[in-house]
């Protein structure tokens, strides 16, 4: 089954993805759609690389922002909504037949959370609920959501490393920060 | 507007050949996944072949491997399926589409008949 | 190869009632599926993909639903020009299947 990330309405959601260039700088086109992978190619394509650069996005809220020559084809999708919520393939399309690389995705967007700071709470929590914790070269993992904040940490494995994912409770306790869930 | 328009049919014997053509216009075809589907007289639907863009990638249905060659030609906007080694069950009509994974556009079909 | 199984075979509906069709598979195919119509004499129109998308042009009347291995297209309100046969598509596995149709016929 394929992978979880979540983001809040509003914020950019990142959904990883990536291979290894080989030779280095050899890119292979990459296609991104809405919905499971499918035999061929994608469908409903949201954004398409060739061997050099992007070449067809439907909107300009999805974005390559890693190192693309590098093989770092994780989509961001910028101010994301309800609706952006479902599956997504990403498919590297290695040349040769039924040589492609297919990884399911899955997006869930929720509302923002209602959070209540203290009075000496001088940040923004808002930017701070749900958070992208970046861990090593792989830029960020899954989201970390309020509403169930375990005291542990939490493995995620996904296609390419194992994460691990810190909670934000020991932050907010100190803040002073009443959290409620929307 | 597309327009699918595919040619070729007709009567052939048991272990003959036939190329079958499709003319392609109101979209840019070099854009597409192109395919075959075929329907047996009075039976349902059955995919036969598809071919990538720029015709690199051509997949079969375990059938006709062997026996069928799908190809295209981009500056002419045109699809073929070069049947050879024809079979009585290979007898349907014979559809074009464009698409990879489900098809939006189809021809009017050609009718092939394999027959002694 | 996947099989995908349609029932009924044959649908008698009055004009003006509501029409379901079943696709149904062994295995998950999450929304990679397709409906198409088939008049006889001509070639099929798509009708719905990704489960539950209607194609361009296609009437509202018209709706897809289901994921995984169970699927249903449903015609709200049937008009004369619907009666034909219905068949569903999968694209989630090679090779790409058809069911083997449901016929909708006048009541």
């Known amino acids: 089954s394929e992978v979880e990330y979540i983001a809040e309405v509003g914020q950019n959601a990142y959904l990883p993805c990536s291979y290894t260039p080989a030779p280095p700088g050899n890119l292979v086109p990459v296609c991104w759609g809405k919905g499971a992978c499918p035999v061929f190619d994608c469908s409903n394509v949201v954004l398409r690389t060739d061997n050099r650069d992007v070449n067809d996005r439907t909107s300009g809220r999805y974005w390559l922002k890693g190192d693309f020559h590098k093989g770092d084809v994780s989509l961001t999708i910028e101010n994301v909504t309800l609706a952006d919520s479902g599956v997504y393939c990403c498919r590297i399309q290695i040349p040769g037949i039924m040589n492609d690389e297919k990884h399911n995705v899955k997006l869930v967007v929720i509302k923002p959370a209602k959070v209540t700071p203290a009075p000496t709470l001088q940040r923004d929590l808002t930017s701070a609920f749900p958070r992208m914790l970046t861990t090593g070269e792989h830029g960020p993992a899954e989201t970390q959501t309020p509403g169930s904040l375990p005291d542990v940490n939490l493995t995620v494995s996904n296609f390419f490393c194992e994460l691990q994912i810190f909670t934000l409770t020991n932050e907010l306790r100190d803040s002073g920060a009443t959290i409620r869930t929307a | 507007e597309v327009q699918l328009v595919e040619s070729g049919g007709g009567l052939v014997q048991p272990g003959g050949s036939l190329r079958l053509s499709c003319a392609a216009s109101?979209?840019?075809?070099?854009?597409?996944?192109m395919t075959w589907v075929r329907q047996a007289p009075g039976k349902g639907l059955e995919w036969v072949a598809n071919?990538?863009?720029?015709?690199?990638?051509?997949y079969y249905v375990d059938s006709v491997k062997g026996r069928f060659t799908i190809s295209r030609d981009n500056a002419k906007n045109s699809l073929y399926l070069q049947m050879n080694s024809l079979r009585a069950e290979d007898t349907a009509v014979y559809y074009c589409?464009?698409?990879?994974?489900?098809?939006?556009?189809w021809g009017q079909g050609t009718l092939v008949t394999v027959s002694s | 190869e996947i099989v995908m199984t349609q029932s009924p075979a044959t649908l008698s509906v009055s004009p003006g009632e509501r029409a379901t069709l079943s696709c149904r598979a062994r295995?998950?195919?999450?929304?990679?599926l397709a409906w198409y119509q088939q008049k006889p004499g001509q070639a099929p129109r798509l009708l719905i993909y990704g489960a539950s998308t209607r194609a361009t042009g296609i009437p509202a009347r018209f709706s897809g639903s289901g994921s995984g291995t169970e699927f249903t297209l449903t015609i709200s309100s049937l008009q004369s020009e619907d009666f034909a046969v219905y068949y569903c598509q999968q694209y989630n596995n090679w090779p790409l299947t058809f069911g083997g149709g449901t016929k909708v016929e006048i009541k």
């Open positions: 295995q998950n195919f999450y929304s990679n």
């Open positions: 109101g979209f840019t075809f070099s854009n597409s996944w």
């Open positions: 071919i990538k863009q720029a015709g690199t990638e051509k």
């Open positions: 589409n464009s698409g990879s994974n489900y098809f939006d556009y």
